[in-house]
């Protein structure tokens, strides 16, 4: 709200624009008639110094010139780079109530002269579009400076535009504005960056190229792929490319990949057979284009295409296995199960699965389709029969994966021979054993199968088995093992139509059982005294059982409990003990044991024997 | 431990039907393929068919087209339609739930409904 400059002048010398590390003197005047009123003599001017609207210092020590009442000169040192508020203002000393009262204010500017620009770098994005350049502007100066962009070429062919850099924006790119056109390929253009501001000035180096070298072809448009006879492997890429293209840079890969399938192609004029795709894969194409075989720049790639390939038929064979149970007198309930193909073996939706049991002797089938991968069947215990399943998806059907129905486990002598199961970490178990020691027939190959011991449906929860050649005696599983988890493990020995097995449990992590077994009944058999328990739940387990305590002791003793140690079966829950006195009471519990420890003690039940009990 | 509870047993003519139901109460939890069998007088128990958790159906060869096994989750509830029923059906039936624990399959049993086919 004040009349800036009323009161006086205020002046810079040398200018108000200075090189980093110069000196500066400030006068600042009062107008004839202007001041303290009636004392001229009490004028006192004083120099305020803002950097960003904030005060930083007084410069009253800085007088280097003084006119009493009338001007003064400050000088001004080691200012900093950009810009610097000076403001003169005029103190009344008789009147120390009175704010000083401002004169008039400067700016200085503290800044360098431009560097030369470098690294002239000039295109032409599309055959027409236009010329752009752009540079390094090397230091930032902090002053205004004005950069020119002069272009010349054949038949005296001149261009020039501007642009200007300051705290606020940065010139260091500039359109030219004007097209180069093929037919000028083989002629030179000399561009040069001029810059100045008030400190001085710079030309860049000529920077010399020819239309090759700055145009960039835009990228392809319009991709398309069209696939041959509704091939999944076989496509051919199509796109539009500007006129001048001879040469293009095809890569694809499957969505979920990490690296690019490469391609070079010359004069394809937006056309290109692909032989190597993927069935039922979802691919990514791009391209990219080229005006000249050696020399000139690659173009952006082109904007993505997705796209899935179409189907195939499967190829790969399923990997089949089986469950048998005899379910009445003369019947069999054969449970069929496969794993999924691997996507690039199903080489497409697998819309269903094609099961067939036949009895081989009298030529009986049994064929079903399923969505499922499991089928269940009865059929009589008579006979060989042998199962096949193929899998179809909508252009046709795998080779059928055929499987003989034996004994599994009907062949002791051709039982693996010193199974072991052994914990490696918290998701995976070592199997290992040797094979059979007197087979009559060769083995064919093994399985690894494994089942968690805890309740289960045998559809819902189908088993999970791995295929070893007869030459290794070993396999990790891993699949759906779970920590605190006693599972049931099988190796199979099978040869072409007999099959011999052998059991062992597993875990792959354990810890002591939650609790102890729970006694049900104490009753007295020919002087012997029987105890009868139910299980720990499965949950509580945590691990494979290795056996069962059964601890007793002389009520109100104070001595150790006597124990005796069963080994774990589940069919069993009860167990004769027969060192008891008649006609005492005890105290009995039991506890369960794992690989980690023992559990805490399950209930006690108090019995006192009454016969002879030895 | 599974307790299962048959029902609706009686007599009827040949030719007639009946429906028979099963419900199961216990740890179900991992029970899903239940089956129905038969014992006629002096002879073995014999299968009569079965459902499993997919709904798979399957049966022994003489009711094949006349029975119709079902089930209904939310009761946990099997059943057994029998249609144009002749006197060789004649018999106790059974419902069954098989379990399996590792390798071992446990069988569940309910206490029989007695059918008769008699004009």
């Known amino acids: 709200n004040i009349d800036v400059c009323k009161l006086g002048t205020v002046t810079v010398q040398p200018a108000p624009v200075i090189p980093l590390g110069s000196a500066a003197n400030i006068s600042c005047s009062l107008n004839p008639k202007q001041g303290c009123s009636h004392y001229p003599s009490s004028n006192e001017l004083i120099l305020l110094k803002f950097v960003n609207d904030v005060l930083v210092e007084n410069l009253h020590g800085k007088k280097v010139h003084d006119h009493t009442g009338h001007s003064s000169t400050f000088q001004v040192t080691n200012l900093s780079l950009g810009m610097t508020l000076f403001v003169c203002k005029l103190n009344c000393s008789n009147s120390q109530k009175k704010p000083p009262v401002p004169v008039c204010g400067v700016e200085i500017s503290v800044g360098v002269a431009p560097e030369p620009p470098q690294n002239i770098s000039c295109v032409q994005e599309g055959e027409n579009g236009t010329v752009a350049c752009s540079w390094n502007s090397g230091k930032v100066t902090y002053l205004k400076t004005n950069y020119t962009l002069q272009l010349s070429g054949p038949n005296n062919l001149t261009c020039q535009k501007q642009c200007f850099s300051d705290n606020r924006q940065n010139c260091n790119r500039l359109d030219l504005g004007i097209n180069l056109s093929p037919d000028l390929a083989e002629s030179r253009f000399i561009v040069r960056v001029t810059a100045i501001n008030d400190l001085g000035n710079s030309s860049s180096l000529p920077h010399t190229f020819t239309f090759l070298d700055i145009v960039i072809p835009l990228p392809p448009w319009d991709i398309r792929i069209n696939f041959l006879n509704a091939s999944g492997s076989r496509g051919t890429l199509q796109w539009e490319d500007e006129g001048q293209v001879v040469l293009n840079q095809l890569r694809y890969q499957p969505l979920n990949s990490t690296s690019w399938n490469m391609v070079n192609a010359t004069n394809a004029k937006g056309k290109y057979d692909l032989r190597d795709l993927r069935p039922f894969t979802e691919y990514e194409f791009q391209i990219s284009s080229k005006l000249h075989l050696s020399g000139g720049s690659w173009s952006n790639w082109s904007e993505s295409l997705r796209t899935r390939t179409p189907e195939e038929e499967p190829v790969g064979i399923l990997d089949i296995w089986y469950m048998k149970q005899d379910i009445d007198y003369d019947r069999q309930q054969i449970s069929l199960f496969w794993k999924s193909l691997n996507p690039s073996e199903a080489r497409g939706k697998i819309l269903h699965y094609q099961v067939t049991l036949q009895e081989v002797t009298k030529k009986t089938t049994l064929q079903n389709t399923t969505r499922h991968t499991s089928w269940t069947r009865v059929i009589p215990r008579t006979g060989a029969w042998t199962a096949s399943v193929s899998a179809a998806n909508s252009k046709g059907a795998s080779a059928p994966t055929h499987i003989n129905i034996v004994d599994l486990c009907g062949t002791g002598l051709l039982a693996p021979h010193q199974v072991s199961a052994k914990s490696e970490n918290m998701d995976n178990i070592l199997v290992t054993w040797q094979p059979p020691k007197k087979a009559d027939s060769a083995v064919r190959e093994y399985i690894v199968e494994w089942r968690a011991l805890q309740p289960g449906s045998i559809t819902k929860f189908p088993p999970h088995w791995l295929r070893i050649p007869p030459d290794n005696m070993s396999a990790l599983i891993s699949e759906n093992i779970k920590p605190y988890i006693c599972y049931e493990i099988r190796v199979h020995a099978l040869s072409e139509s007999q099959g011999g097995c052998s059991s062992i449990r597993g875990d792959s992590k354990h810890k002591a059982p939650v609790s102890g077994p729970h006694i049900t009944a104490i009753t007295e058999k020919k002087e012997r005294l029987f105890i009868s328990w139910t299980h720990i739940p499965f949950p509580e387990q945590r691990g494979c059982i290795l056996h069962y305590r059964i601890y007793w002791k002389e009520r109100d003793s104070t001595a150790q409990p006597e124990l005796c140690e069963i080994q774990y079966r589940r069919s069993q829950n009860s167990h004769p003990i027969s060192s008891l006195q008649p006609r005492v009471t005890y105290v009995l519990w039991m506890t369960a044991v794992t690989a980690a420890g023992e559990s805490p003690q399950g209930n006690e039940r108090e019995f006192c024997p009454q016969g002879k009990a030895n | 431990q599974v307790q299962l509870q048959e029902s609706g047993g009686g007599l009827v003519q040949p030719g007639g039907s009946l429906r028979l139901s099963c419900t199961a109460s216990?740890?179900?939890?991992?029970?899903?393929?239940m089956y129905w069998y038969r014992q006629a007088p002096g002879k073995q128990r014999e299968f009569v068919a079965y459902?499993?958790?997919?709904?798979?159906?399957n049966y022994l060869d003489s009711v094949n087209g006349r029975f119709t096994i079902s089930r209904d989750n939310a009761k946990n509830s099997v059943y057994l339609q029998m249609n144009s029923l002749k006197p060789e059906d004649t018999a106790v039936y059974y419902c069954?739930?098989?379990?399996?624990?590792?390798?071992?399959?446990?069988?569940?049993w309910g206490q029989g409904t007695q059918v008769t086919v008699s004009s």
């Open positions: 459902i499993t958790a997919t709904n798979s159906a």
């Open positions: 216990g740890s179900i939890f991992a029970i899903d393929d």
């Open positions: 069954n739930a098989k379990q399996i624990v590792g390798f071992q399959i446990d069988d569940y």
